[in-house]
Interface confidence: low
């Protein structure tokens, strides 16, 4: 067992070295590890195969260090982790496409709060098995198409706290089984209407704090699941363009919340679900 | 197989009581907000009630309101409808439906159920 | 009474084509709620249609369709078969209400 680490075995085999101001991926971490905790270090780089021996590792927590590079070989042969934690380290910037190919166990993913400013083509790809992506507090300002596209059994993505200027058409594809969706605290001004496609059982989306004057309905058409619908602090526009929003908003029976129009001056404030449809004049 | 299985239909006096329930299978029951439609022998289609899929928010249509109550047990994949002080007008085939359409928590109604004969009368 | 219109009846010759109106008003279509279509059969539960105006579920055949205009909406079918002989019910949700509201119905038949 590495010098700054505690290792046991039950409840499972763990390698637990937290805060130890550890600058590096210690040495000598037994290869029986199912459960390795290297959170709250020093560490700044994860270089290739650092955990190849641990081919029983499940969960491997490396959140809250300085980690700015991670080799894109660095969790080879970890084919039935579960868990990877790689959040806070806001250093990291970016992340080399391949490094998590082979982790076709992996059910949560944690990539928050690690400065990313755009998501690799094929990043996810072959993670199949992955539920929750945390992506939110990061510096991404878009969302290439077809990013999730592997993620069919992906039911939480958060991605709030971002600078998304755009949902594009193809950002969201393949998610089937997704349940929430938080885009909130974005500036997000533009969504295709057909970027909801695959979304059928979505039940929760935040889209508040954004940049939204308007929003196509088609969009929210595919949404047959939808519970609950933030759609406030944005600059809506309340004019007849807003009227198929309107529409939509007196039908849907789920809970969402206020929608304070920002334009025209005459309605700013009133919320769009409580107007009349002849307040939505112009065009 | 996505399937609805109305029952508890029956004859019942003016003024009495039934609980119809509904049965559903293939699809996430919680995911889907549920209606009751109506049919009397040989009208056209009404609705009745809805319910949103966590069973937080219930409709009414204007002729059964105060009478009628619309819930549903998740964890039993089933659907209710208790029908009070019932009328000689409210006899009709009673659908149950699932309402699939935008947010799935709205108006359009993909599959029904076979339904179950409610008749009011003395 | 019902909220949308339609007509009591309509008919046609096999490989003709027919259309079925559904009349609402400005709190209902024409506010911009979408309209559905449903087939039934005599002793039957009804069947969606037509969807969202003009959409339709996978199974049905194209020659069922949908449109809308204003506060009406009209179902067409074409090349009209045997089988198509059933009721037609277009619904929308009225604003004013609150509600779903149907339309009375349409008896096709097939001469």
């Known amino acids: 067992c590495p010098g700054a680490c505690v290792c046991y075995n039950e409840p499972k085999v763990t390698t637990s070295c937290p805060q130890q101001g550890l600058q590096a991926v210690p040495v000598g971490i037994p290869a029986a590890s199912q459960r390795i905790f290297l959170h709250g270090n020093r560490i700044s780089h994860v270089p290739a195969a650092s955990f190849r021996a641990c081919r029983n590792l499940t969960i491997l927590w490396l959140h809250s260090n300085v980690l700015a590079r991670i080799d894109a070989a660095a969790f080879t042969g970890l084919a039935l982790l579960e868990q990877l934690d790689l959040s806070d380290n806001a250093q990291l910037r970016s992340v080399d496409p391949a490094t998590f190919h082979g982790l076709g166990r992996l059910h949560t993913l944690h990539l928050d709060r690690c400065g990313l400013q755009e998501l690799g083509p094929g990043l996810f790809r072959g993670l199949a098995a992955l539920q929750y992506l945390y992506l939110q507090d990061n510096a991404l300002q878009a969302l290439p198409d077809d990013t999730f596209r592997d993620l069919g059994n992906l039911t939480h993505l958060f991605l709030h706290g971002n600078r998304i200027s755009s949902v594009p058409e193809r950002a969201f594809r393949g998610l089937h089984s997704l349940d929430r969706l938080l885009l909130h605290q974005n500036r997000v001004a533009h969504v295709h209407p057909h970027a909801f496609r695959d979304l059928g059982r979505l039940m929760t989306l935040y889209l508040f704090a954004n940049n939204l004057s308007a929003l196509p309905t088609e969009a929210l058409a595919p949404l047959r699941a939808l519970q609950y619908l933030r759609l406030n602090d944005n600059p809506w526009v309340c004019d007849c363009r807003a009227r198929p929003l309107w529409a939509w908003l007196q039908k849907f029976r789920g809970s969402s919340s206020e929608v304070p129009c920002s334009l025209p001056q005459r309605l700013a404030g009133r919320d769009l679900k409580r107007l009349a449809a002849n307040d939505l004049q112009g065009c | 197989e996505v399937q609805l299985l109305e029952s508890g239909g029956g004859l019942v006096q003016p003024g009495g009581s039934l609980r119809l329930s509904c049965a559903a299978s293939g699809f996430t029951f919680s995911s889907y907000a549920m209606s009751w439609v109506r049919q009397a022998p040989g009208k056209g289609l009404e609705w009745v009630s809805a319910i949103s899929g966590s069973g937080g928010s219930t409709y009414y249509a204007d002729s059964v309101k105060g009478r009628f109550t619309i819930s549903r047990d998740n964890s039993k994949n089933t659907l209710y409808l208790q029908m009070n002080s019932l009328r000689a007008e409210d006899t009709a085939v009673y659908y149950c439906?699932?309402?699939?359409?935008?947010?799935?928590?709205?108006?359009?109604?993909?599959?029904w159920g076979r339904g179950t004969l409610v008749t009011v009368s003395s | 009474q019902s909220v949308l219109t339609q007509p009591p009846s309509v008919s046609g010759a096999p490989g003709q084509g027919v259309s079925i109106s559904c009349t609402g008003t400005?709190?209902?279509?024409?506010?911009?709620?979408?309209v559905q279509w449903y087939q039934q059969f005599p002793g039957t539960a009804p069947k969606l249609l037509i969807y969202?105006?003009?959409r339709r579920p996978s199974g049905v055949p194209e020659r069922f369709s949908g449109s809308k205009s204003g506060t009406s909406a009209s179902l067409a079918i074409t090349g009209l078969r045997t089988e198509d002989e059933a009721d037609y019910y277009c619904?929308?949700?009225?604003?004013?209400?609150?509600?779903?509201?149907f339309g009375g119905g349409t008896k096709l038949t097939v001469l």
């Open positions: 439906a699932r309402e699939g359409g935008i947010l799935g928590a709205v108006d359009v109604f993909d599959i």
């Open positions: 400005t709190s209902d279509i024409g506010a911009g709620y979408t």
């Open positions: 969202d105006d003009y």
């Open positions: 619904q929308s949700y009225d604003n004013s209400l609150k509600n779903v509201v």
